[in-house]
């Protein structure tokens, strides 16, 4: 048994449910929106389309005491080969420019969406 | 919020040229499909151009093809219509606007107008 114990644990979650799962964490979140999301707190907006996942969670991981977008600051880190801490700042980012995080969120869902249906898991 | 500011409309006689600008702010423009749009007095709004997020692919209404050119800048936020061999019947208010099929990511900007005339 406790060889084959490894075999039933599960193994790597395949990219394209990581990413089916993630897109349906942010349509929970767009619809389900009341108040204003994380108090209408303003994040770093980003101006490409290479490393987005890093890019999108050095954003959202500068937004603190925001229990509706934790979940998804969790699933981002999946896709993020290295390791994300507040304060980070990336070229992917647009310095002067902040946007609101219902509508980052709302944009990154209609991007990952778009992959999706390109085929891009990754 | 999300704001589109179109500018660079005027008068223009006819063959000649206008560059469109329009500056984008409040959302993240290089995830949208974005295009121009254009209403000439007394008629219908028509689409005039589209152009992917990446600026890869392009649509051109059959009136411009060959004399119109979109294109964008996604580390400015900018959208752009190069216009040349204007006509009169390009006469129009020019929109900037998103071009997503995806409902509720419809945004507009006021308009910018051009008129061709000699």
């Known amino acids: 048994l406790t060889c084959l114990g490894g075999f039933a644990s599960p193994g790597p979650v395949p990219p394209s449910t990581a990413l089916r799962e993630l897109i349906e964490e942010l349509v929970n979140i767009t619809q389900n929106q009341k108040a204003p999301l994380c108090n209408g707190s303003m994040v770093w907006s980003i101006n490409l389309t290479a490393g987005m996942y890093c890019a999108a969670l050095e954003s959202l991981i500068n937004v603190s005491g925001c229990s509706a977008i934790e979940k998804t600051q969790r699933m981002l880190s999946g896709f993020c080969p290295h390791k994300v801490s507040a304060g980070q700042f990336s070229s992917l980012h647009v310095r002067d420019t902040k946007i609101e995080v219902a509508q980052f969120v709302k944009d990154l869902l209609l991007h990952l969406k778009k992959l999706f249906r390109e085929g891009q898991f990754n | 919020g999300v704001q589109l500011l179109e500018s660079g409309g005027g008068l223009v006689q006819p063959g000649g040229s206008l560059r469109l600008s329009c500056a984008a702010s409040?959302?993240?423009?290089?995830?949208?499909?974005m295009g121009w749009a254009r209403q000439a007095p007394g008629k219908g709004l028509e689409w005039v151009s589209k152009i992917g997020d990446k600026g890869g692919k392009t649509y051109y209404a059959d009136s411009v093809k060959g004399r119109f050119t979109i294109s964008r800048d996604n580390s400015k936020n900018t959208l752009y219509l190069q216009m040349n061999s204007l006509r009169a019947e390009d006469t129009a208010v020019y929109y900037c606007?998103?071009?997503?099929?995806?409902?509720?990511?419809?945004?507009w900007g006021q308009g910018t107008l051009v008129t061709v005339s000699s």
């Open positions: 409040g959302f993240i423009f290089a995830w949208y499909d």
């Open positions: 606007a998103t071009a997503e099929d995806e409902p509720g990511y419809d945004y």
